[in-house]
Structure formats: structure tokens, C-alpha cells
């Protein structure tokens, strides 16, 4: 059928609560494309009727809620004018008690389930809630060992739990809970997080190391498409954010309307002592305004930039 197959990492999810997955694969989904979701190689697309428990919502597949029998491989097919990509996502559903955060023994747990706080620092935990715009999320409550978290050291800020002056006693099993509203119905979302405490700050020192770029310029023709990787090494237990910024603004926010320049999905390769992270920036079409502007890759406190430059004229 001419579609290129792309395999995503496994997602491990809780039964009896909402779940959503967005079919984005920059730069494929940046232009004019159609996205269709299928389950287990079925020829019949996932329903787009919003009353259906499982339905497609724009580029998302939405489960309201996820059920035990929903485990399997889902495909989203992205069709552009001249291309077709089929993204395969393996979803594994498991039963989980309301306050149960220790889900050891499950393979390839995402970092959303395992987070790090840094001893003696002000730090934070993140409640990862990825849902389409049609889902409205209420305020988040945080629990530790099944009990609500309280105290002047803890502050809930949007999707984060801020912890001031982290102590060794802050390790343990946490859960964040939110009420999701969709089409007038309410659902509870509960994410478990196993938290460990570290004194170490970074790979080979106190900061993440940006391998590429190296504060340099790149020659690129006007109107072309350009993809630049930012490669970062960091400790396995780091909590650093990696992103691309321009004019001190996230590129996805800066180019929110045109979506001409986008940040890619972060990937990483695990080594024994550290992780190698890659997050790219895609210029769908380089414009004059892009030249001379530093596009910054950030990784924790580390930064490195690229500057686009017009190629020197060829007088041959």
C-alpha cells in the first residue's frame, strides 16, 4: 500500500481510566495531511463519533475509559500529498489499585512513572496528562503512599508538584489525580509515580552535555526544508527538560500559528552510565527572517545554538 512503517515504543497504561495518544510525527504531520487510526491492522477505522468509548479526536485516539481488552497494536496512518506513513503503537493495559504506584516488573516503563528529586534543592514532580483539547482537566491532587500531600514545602502549580528543600524522606510512591470532563461526562485520571532522591547533578559533572550543535552556523538555501538534531548526554536519573527555543520562547509557541518551525519528539538511547537524548527542530521552509537568528537547544542549564546562513554565492 506504499506506506512507510514507523514503530513507536510501548505504552503501558492503567485500566478503568481515560487515555489518549496523539499521532504526531514531525515533520510528517506539519503540513496538509489526513490522519486515520486503526486497531490491530483492521481495515475499519476507529470511530470518529464522540459518544464512542474509543474514538478518534482530530489526530488523537481517545479511550474513555481504557479497558482491559483494549491492549494491542494501534496504527495511525498519516497521508500527505506525496507520502504515507503508518505509525504503530503498542498499548498494554494493566489493572492498578487507586493508590498503587509501584508497578515494577513491567517492561520499558516510561519516565513518566519514574521521577527524580534532587536532595537539598527546590524541585518538582510532573503529572503527565496528555489529552486533546476536547478534554477539560480539573485541578490536580497529589498523594503519597495513598494519603493526600500537605505542608508548606509542597505547592501544586498546574501539572506540577513543587517540593522545596527536598529531603531523603521525599522518596517513595506518589500519585496525581485529576478529573477529566468530556462531552459532559466526568472521568478520574490517576497517574502513579515512583520517586527516588539523588544528590548527583549531571553526566560527567554537574550539567548535561550538548554534543551537537556547537554554537555554529549552518548554510542553507532559502525555501528548503531543514532538520537539525540536538544531541545531549545526561545521567540516567536526570529530570532536565530538553527543548528548542528562539527569542527565549519555545519554538512550538513562537511559531504557534504558522507551525512552520516545530520541535520534534524526543528520543533517547540508554547506555550503561548515561542516556543520549535527541530532540530535533524542523524548518518546513526556511525564510529570510530565519537567517542570523540563534535557535537555541536547551538541556537543563546547558545551551547551544545554530544560526542559519545563506550559502555564499557561486560565481563559477
Amino acid at each position: 500500500d506504499g506506506c512507510k512503517d514507523i514503530f513507536m515504543k510501548n505504552e503501558i497504561l492503567s485500566a478503568s481510566q481515560p487515555f489518549a495518544f496523539n499521532c504526531t510525527f514531525p515533520p510528517i504531520t506539519s503540513g496538509e495531511v489526513s490522519v486515520t487510526w486503526y486497531k490491530n491492522s483492521s481495515k475499519i477505522p476507529v470511530s470518529k463519533i464522540i459518544q464512542s468509548r474509543i474514538h478518534q479526536d482530530e489526530t488523537w485516539i481517545l479511550f474513555l475509559p481504557m479497558e482491559w481488552g483494549d491492549s494491542g497494536v494501534y496504527q495511525c496512518v498519516i497521508k500527505g500529498r506525496d507520502s504515507c506513513h503508518r505509525i504503530h503503537v503498542n498499548l498494554t493495559v494493566f489493572e492498578k489499585h487507586w493508590c498503587d504506584t509501584s508497578i515494577g516488573g513491567l517492561p520499558n516503563l516510561s519516565d513518566e512513572y519514574k521521577q527524580i528529586l534532587h536532595l537539598g534543592k527546590d524541585d518538582s514532580l510532573t503529572c503527565h496528562l496528555h489529552f486533546p483539547k476536547s478534554c477539560v482537566l480539573g485541578p490536580i491532587k497529589w498523594y503519597k503512599d495513598c494519603n493526600e500531600i500537605k505542608g508548606e514545602r509542597f505547592t501544586v502549580l498546574e501539572t506540577r508538584l513543587l517540593v522545596s528543600n527536598v529531603s531523603a524522606e521525599d522518596r517513595g510512591n506518589y500519585a496525581c489525580q485529576a478529573i477529566l470532563t468530556h462531552s459532559g461526562k466526568q472521568y478520574e485520571v490517576l497517574n502513579g509515580i515512583t520517586v527516588s532522591i539523588t544528590e548527583r547533578a549531571g553526566y560527567g559533572g554537574s550539567v548535561p552535555k550538548i554534543i551537537y550543535p556547537k554554537n555554529h552556523s549552518i548554510e542553507v538555501q532559502l525555501g528548503t526544508t531543514l532538520i537539525v538534531d540536538c544531541n545531549v548526554t545526561d545521567t540516567k536519573d536526570n529530570t532536565n527538560l530538553r527543548c528548542w527555543r528562539v527569542n527565549n520562547t519555545l519554538v512550538d509557541d513562537y511559531y504557534d500559528e504558522s507551525k512552520r518551525i516545530r520541535e520534534g519528539v524526543e528520543t533517547h538511547v540508554s547506555f550503561r552510565e548515561h542516556n543520549l537524548y535527541t530532540v530535533n527542530i524542523t524548518f518546513l521552509e526556511v525564510k529570510m527572517e530565519d537567517y542570523g537568528l540563534p535557535f537555541m537547544c536547551h538541556a537543563g542549564v546547558s545551551t547551544a545554538y545554530i544560526i542559519l546562513q545563506l550559502p555564499a554565492p557561486d560565481f563559477r
Epitope: 487507586w98 498503587d100 509501584s102 500537605k150 505542608g151 509542597f154 517513595g172 510512591n173
Partner: antibody, heavy 116, light 107 residues
């Protein structure tokens, strides 16, 4: 390091009250729940209830509602458990146990003897 | 309330033996279960947190596992200092409840 130091042994008459203290050091006192557990001689462990030092929210086991009062003194990082209308079957060792992570640290215990 | 049924109530074993103690929860408690060791005249000491996480300083011969609502504490090779009483505790929802205890004695 973390320490929970309880008050000394008490001998009380039936009908009287006893107030046991638990002084905390080594962690942020107002960040975590504190539990109280008792153990009658030769018997098992029994959860009585818990209090959060931040706002004094208390949760009690049904058996102890009306007879147990838990309080907090933030200035001294101390939690108190008062048991009233004592009877002979209240003779037990009373422990405080912190929920920094669930029931991680325990006091050394306070023996309360109820005898006429 | 959640009931915790612990078995056996006592057992006799020799140094080097493999010992297994079980707690059954009357309803789903996820992994919210601890194991404690108590010696006469002393406060309980936590061995295992959240079903299977070994507390710092606890010998690796102690391990915890779960199958549904059945929880197991295993001592792979009993040592002289392990003769004591062991309790499980569920903290999934209050009122929190302990198992009745298992006394491990020298054969």
C-alpha cells in the same frame, strides 16, 4: 538522622486519661502524617489513627472515636495522643510511627498500665 | 474495613531454612503493603515497603512479592538474628490494618 522519642511509662487508674508525647527530629515535621499504633501484652499491632501536623487533620479508627484526641505542637515538633476513660484493656505499649514513607520510622514505645 | 489474614501464626525453623510467610487482603490493596520484624520489648522494624522494596540496611535474604491479594515475605536462608515476630500492614485505605503476626521460633 530521623528520631521519634516518646514520653516515659505511665500507670493510670481506670476512668483516668493519659497523654503520650512523640517528639520528632531529623525530618520536616509538618510534611508527613503521624500514626499511633498500640500493642497489648502478648498481642498484635493495632492502628489507632493518624494526624497531619500541617493542619491537624485527624483520622481515627472507629474503635477509638470519642476516646482518643491527637494534637500537635509545631513549635516543639511534638505530636500528642490522649486516651480518656481508661479501662484495664487499654494496658498496652503505644507507638508513634511516621508516614514519611508509609510507617517508616517508629518511636520506642510508651507502656501505659491501667490498674486500680 | 480491609482484613489482613496472616499465616501461619507460628512456625519452627532451623538456621539456613527458607521461610515463607503469607498475608491475604480481603480486598484489592494494590502494592500498599509493608512487612515488619519485631523482637521482644522493641518497636517494629520495617523490612519491606510497598510489597517488594527492601528498606536500606535490610539484608537481601528478605524479599517480598505479590500475587493478586496474596502477599509473601520470604527469608531465603534463616539466620540466628531472624528469630522474631513478623507482621504485615496494609496502608491502602484507613483504617490501616495489620496481620495477626507470625512468630518464627528455633526448631
Amino acid at each position: 538522622q530521623v528520631q521519634l522519642v516518646q514520653s516515659g511509662a505511665e500507670v493510670k487508674k481506670p476512668g483516668a486519661s493519659v497523654k503520650v508525647s512523640c517528639k520528632v527530629s531529623g525530618y520536616f515535621f509538618t510534611s508527613y502524617w503521624m500514626n499511633w499504633v498500640n500493642q497489648a501484652p502478648g498481642q498484635g499491632l493495632e492502628w489507632m489513627g493518624m494526624i497531619h501536623p500541617y493542619d491537624s487533620e485527624t483520622r481515627l479508627a472507629q474503635k477509638f472515636k470519642g476516646r482518643v484526641t491527637m494534637t500537635v505542637d509545631k513549635s516543639t515538633s511534638t505530636v500528642y495522643m490522649e486516651l480518656s476513660s481508661l479501662r484495664s484493656e487499654d494496658t498496652a505499649v503505644y507507638y508513634c510511627a511516621s508516614s514519611t514513607t508509609a510507617f517508616a520510622y517508629w518511636g520506642q514505645g510508651t507502656l501505659v498500665t491501667v490498674s486500680s | 474495613d480491609i482484613q489482613m489474614t496472616q499465616s501461619p501464626s507460628s512456625l519452627s525453623a532451623s538456621v539456613g531454612d527458607r521461610v515463607t510467610i503469607t498475608c491475604r487482603a480481603s480486598q484489592d490493596i494494590g502494592n500498599a503493603l509493608n512487612w515488619y520484624q519485631q523482637k521482644p520489648g522493641k518497636a517494629p522494624k520495617r523490612l519491606i515497603y510497598a510489597t517488594s522494596s527492601l528498606d536500606p540496611g535490610v539484608p537481601s535474604r528478605f524479599s517480598g512479592s505479590r500475587s493478586g491479594t496474596d502477599f509473601t515475605l520470604t527469608i531465603s536462608s534463616l539466620q540466628p538474628e531472624d528469630f522474631a515476630t513478623y507482621y504485615c500492614l496494609q496502608y491502602a485505605s484507613s483504617p490501616y490494618t495489620f496481620g495477626q503476626g507470625t512468630k518464627v521460633e528455633i526448631k
